[in-house]
């Protein structure tokens, strides 16, 4: 059983990478002297208590920064937020912390990240770029929900 986070880099189909700007993750075209974030991810250790066949439930954080992605409602709208949190603290909890969990599904080289707390809502970036990561229900429209995840060993 893996009990340390794996590291990875993410870009979307338009070759934009995730960058941390003022405690917000944004997707921007890769350029020189740019520092894309390195993702930390670890599978939930209570996988048997979550839905089957929806993907691998994972916690998603920013490597070395003690920041994790979470989903919370603002009004009636599920939103994506970065919270100060140790990913291993989430991993070790006695129950799945669903607000911090995502179903990671892979199809070929493409990965999607669906909120466990808000089924049907996916991590996305606007097709325009330079915009914050969001949660969307609109698949394959104005937003990109497919990402390339490359694991770093």
């Amino acid at each position: 059983k893996i009990d340390t986070p794996q590291r990875g880099s993410i870009q979307d189909i338009n070759h934009r990478v995730w960058v941390l700007q003022d405690q917000t993750l944004i997707a921007v075209p890769r350029k020189d002297r740019m520092s894309p974030v390195t993702i930390a991810l670890i599978s939930c250790r209570h996988v048997e208590t979550l839905e089957k066949d929806r993907g691998n439930p994972i916690y998603l954080g920013l490597n070395g920064l003690n920041l994790c992605l979470m989903c919370a409602k603002v009004g009636d709208q599920p939103t994506l937020q970065l919270k100060e949190k140790d990913i291993m603290d989430l991993y070790n909890q006695p129950e799945p912390v669903k607000s911090f969990l995502f179903y990671h599904s892979q199809s070929g080289r493409n990965s999607t990240f669906e909120s466990v707390a808000f089924p049907g809502w996916f991590i996305a970036v606007s097709s325009e770029g330079g915009c914050p990561l969001i949660l969307t229900q609109e698949l394959g429209k104005a937003n990109t929900t497919d990402f390339g995840l490359t694991m770093l060993f």
Epitope: H46, T49, L50, E51, Q93, P94, E95, P96, S99
Partner: antibody, heavy 121, light 109 residues
Framework: EVQLQQSGAELVKPGASVKLSCTAS????????IYWVKQRPEQGLEWIGR????????RYDPKFQGKATLTADTSSNTAFLQLSSLTSEDTAVYYC??????????????WGRGTTLTVSS | QAVVTQESALTTSPGETVTLTCRSS?????????ANWVQEKPDHLFTGLIG???NRAPGVPARFSGSLIGDKAALTITGAQTEDEAIYFC?????????FGGGTKLTVL
């Protein structure tokens, strides 16, 4: 105001089954875990198990596997505990409780007032 | 299965500090047991106090604190008040199941 309203006292014959309910108000049970706990007279608490009402997955203490069945109806915001093949050992007060993550930990933050079950012929 | 043991009864006076403990039959209690503390008052009135060993539940007075002392989980009430008279239960996680202690009856005289 958050509340867990439990069904009324039950007097049941040995060998029968009973289904206890726990109806939530002030929050959506899909957003949390509902735990069930047993308390016998002059004894401590025993964890029966828990349900994730959003997806229906359950965990049971091994001692209650086969004795207890946990279900939930999200449309009525209600969790249920069914107990089968009742004996005098099942005479107790049964509590439901919300086990919720807030800030940095899970807590038992709200409890029902319990349902008294008496098994007697 | 693990057995969780608490003092059966303790007595304190208003304003005093009192510590209740929670021992595991399997060895030292650690942060991996995610100790919870729950208060029971008359008429089946339960309140969650502490989760994850030392995290106070929202709305719980600051006089209640959780910790590990030696090989046990502990609940300390600093400056006990008469309304703290109650039964206190600890609960410890063992992998995927939870085990409660027998409870400590705290009298505040």
């Amino acid at each position: 105001e958050v509340q867990l309203q439990q069904s009324g006292a039950e007097l049941v014959k040995p060998g029968a089954s009973v289904k206890l309910s726990c109806t939530a108000s002030g929050f959506n049970i899909k957003d949390t875990y509902i735990y069930w706990v047993k308390q016998r007279p002059e004894q401590g608490l025993e964890w029966i198990g828990r349900i994730d009402p959003a997806i229906g997955t359950t965990r049971y203490d091994p001692k209650f596997q086969g004795k207890a069945t946990l279900t939930a109806d999200t449309s009525s915001n209600t969790a249920f505990l069914q107990l089968s093949s009742l004996t005098s050992e099942d005479t107790a007060v049964y509590y439901c409780a919300r086990y919720d993550y807030s800030g940095s930990s899970f807590y038992f933050d709200y409890w029902g007032r319990g349902t008294t079950l008496t098994v007697s012929s | 299965q693990a057995v969780v043991t608490q003092e059966s009864a303790l007595t304190t006076s208003p304003g005093e500090t009192v510590t209740l403990t929670c021992r595991s039959s399997t060895g030292a209690v650690t942060t991996s047991n995610y100790a919870n503390w729950v208060q029971e008052k008359p008429d089946h009135l339960f309140t969650g106090l502490i989760g994850g060993t030392n995290n106070r539940a929202p709305g719980v007075p600051a006089r209640f604190s959780g910790s590990l002392i030696g090989d046990k989980a502990a609940l300390t009430i600093t400056g006990a008040q008469t309304e703290d008279e109650a039964i206190y239960f600890c609960a410890l996680w063992y992998s995927n199941h939870l085990v409660f202690g027998g409870g400590t009856k705290l009298t505040v005289l």
